[in-house]
Interface confidence: low
């Protein structure tokens, strides 16, 4: 459940803290609830430029296996379709904190819809 | 040991502070291009041990037409479905790489 | 070539604190976890904690007030310190390091640790 | 915890002969993240299957790994002489990690 992948944020922040990652990334930080699986999409694509970036086994074992949990929760829920939505290119990039917490918010939002 | 100037990447420029061993630097994409998402900007020069030559690693860097740009000509509404986003993950290896 | 070794007292009193070394080559410490585990006589494995590439650690609950795991990178060495040993912890621990898919793809030889007055 | 229960404890079978090996999980293993190890006496364990199904490098290949949610099986297609020993399922699906109690697979 969505629970299992606030830990994993939690554990890859903690990981990354005694790393130097300069990385910019797409960050939806005010996410409209039609466009919430969107803006997730999102999120998950630049999770794994932190995996790439970092050279860290334990960081990619930890992005792939939120990705991998967050995946099968939105596919459990059908295929849903939204229009209208930014594309991920069309986000501010944020520093790495920003979008960790970013994404932890929209977590949050998918565990009080759920 | 430096690095020498790093591979080309269509759509992207580098300006490079600094070649010696270790350096990490970052590709910007051109005026009317996005890094696409999932994408890295980064290259680093790293010492190949077998051959004690240093060169650059390969950025994942994709740059795409800006879609800000794209949507001021006609086109379909984006739209996504909930297919997945699919990692690539290294299996695993017989030896520590370091 | 991938090498993990434990060492350590092979004798511990009740109460006393056991301190483990886990000494290791062909990786990198920050970059591979070192997870221990242990196996008392003709009983299934038991796994222990974790001490991830950045230096954070995950314990198992059962043994989370007594058991502290860390590391030292410029010697390669990880080390495991439980307190308050008991007979029951008498077992053989082993240190192995951590592979994609949090699974164990080297293991030490494992050191037998006796509890006994 | 996930509570790993392995059957049959003991498996009694000749060299050549096929082996199937459970692990049943009392909750879901998320990812498939069930590993399988195999041990000696006196040795440390190996690791043969990851992933629930992924062989690990230099496993012979009669070794295979199935299964996904809560029911696992290892099996080992003809049973050579260096295979008898005890097989521990593992899994990571949620903390602590957690093996089973083995499976000790012997020479009739």
């Known amino acids: 459940n969505w629970v299992n992948v606030i830990s994993d944020l939690k554990k890859i922040e903690d990981l990354i803290q005694s790393m130097h990652i300069d990385a910019t990334l797409y960050t939806e930080s005010d996410v409209h609830p039609s466009c919430k699986v969107t803006a997730m999409k999102c999120f998950l694509l630049e999770l794994q430029v932190i995996s790439h970036e970092s050279g860290d086994t334990d960081i990619h074992d930890t992005v792939e296996n939120l990705i991998i949990l967050a995946n099968n929760i939105l596919s459990s829920n059908g295929n849903i379709t939204e229009s209208g939505c930014k594309e991920c290119e069309e986000l501010e990039e944020k520093n790495i904190k920003e979008f960790l917490q970013s994404f932890v918010h929209i977590v949050q939002m998918f565990i009080n819809t759920s | 040991i430096t690095c020498p100037p790093p591979v080309s990447v269509e759509h992207a420029d580098i300006r490079v502070k600094s070649y010696s061993l270790y350096s990490r630097e970052r590709y910007i994409c051109n005026s009317g291009f996005k890094r696409k998402a999932g994408t890295s900007s980064l290259t680093e020069c790293v010492l190949n041990k077998a051959t004690n030559i240093a060169h650059w690693t390969t950025p994942s860097l994709k740059c795409i037409r800006d879609p800000l740009l794209a949507r001021q000509r006609p086109a379909p509404p984006f739209t996504v479905t909930t297919a997945g986003v699919t990692p690539q993950p290294e299996s695993l290896s017989p030896s520590g790489k370091e | 070539q991938v090498t993990l070794k434990e060492s350590g007292p092979v004798l511990v009193k009740p109460t006393e604190t056991l301190t483990l070394t886990c000494t290791v080559s062909?990786?990198?410490?920050?970059?591979?976890?070192v997870h221990w585990i242990r196996q008392p006589p003709g009983k299934a494995l038991e796994w222990l904690g974790v001490?991830?590439?950045?230096?954070?650690?995950d314990y198992n609950p059962s043994f989370m007030s007594r058991l502290t795991i860390s590391k030292d990178t410029s010697k390669s060495q990880v080390v495991l310190t439980m307190t308050n040993m008991d007979p029951v912890d008498t077992a053989t621990y082993y240190c192995?390091?951590?592979?994609?898919?949090?699974?164990?793809?080297?293991w030490g030889q494992g050191t037998t640790v006796t509890v006994s007055s | 915890e996930i509570v790993l229960t392995q059957s049959p404890g003991t498996l009694s079978l000749s060299p050549g002969e096929r082996a199937t090996l459970s692990c049943r999980a009392s909750?879901?293993?998320?990812?498939?993240?069930l590993a399988w190890y195999q041990q000696k006496p006196g040795q440390a364990p190996r690791l043969l299957i990851y992933?629930?199904?992924k062989l690990a490098s230099g496993i012979p290949d009669r070794f295979s790994g199935s299964g996904s949610g809560t029911d696992f099986t290892l099996t080992i297609s003809r049973l050579e002489p260096e295979d008898f020993a005890v097989y521990y399922c593992?899994?990571?699906?949620?903390?602590?990690?957690?093996f089973g109690q083995g499976t000790k697979v012997e020479i009739k």
């Open positions: 909750q879901s293993v998320i990812y498939s993240y």
């Open positions: 001490i991830w590439g950045a230096g954070s650690t």
């Open positions: 062909g990786f990198s410490l920050t970059t591979y976890a």
């Open positions: 192995a390091k951590n592979a994609a898919y949090y699974v164990m793809d080297y």
């Open positions: 992933a629930a199904s």
């Open positions: 593992q899994q990571r699906a949620s903390y602590p990690l957690t």
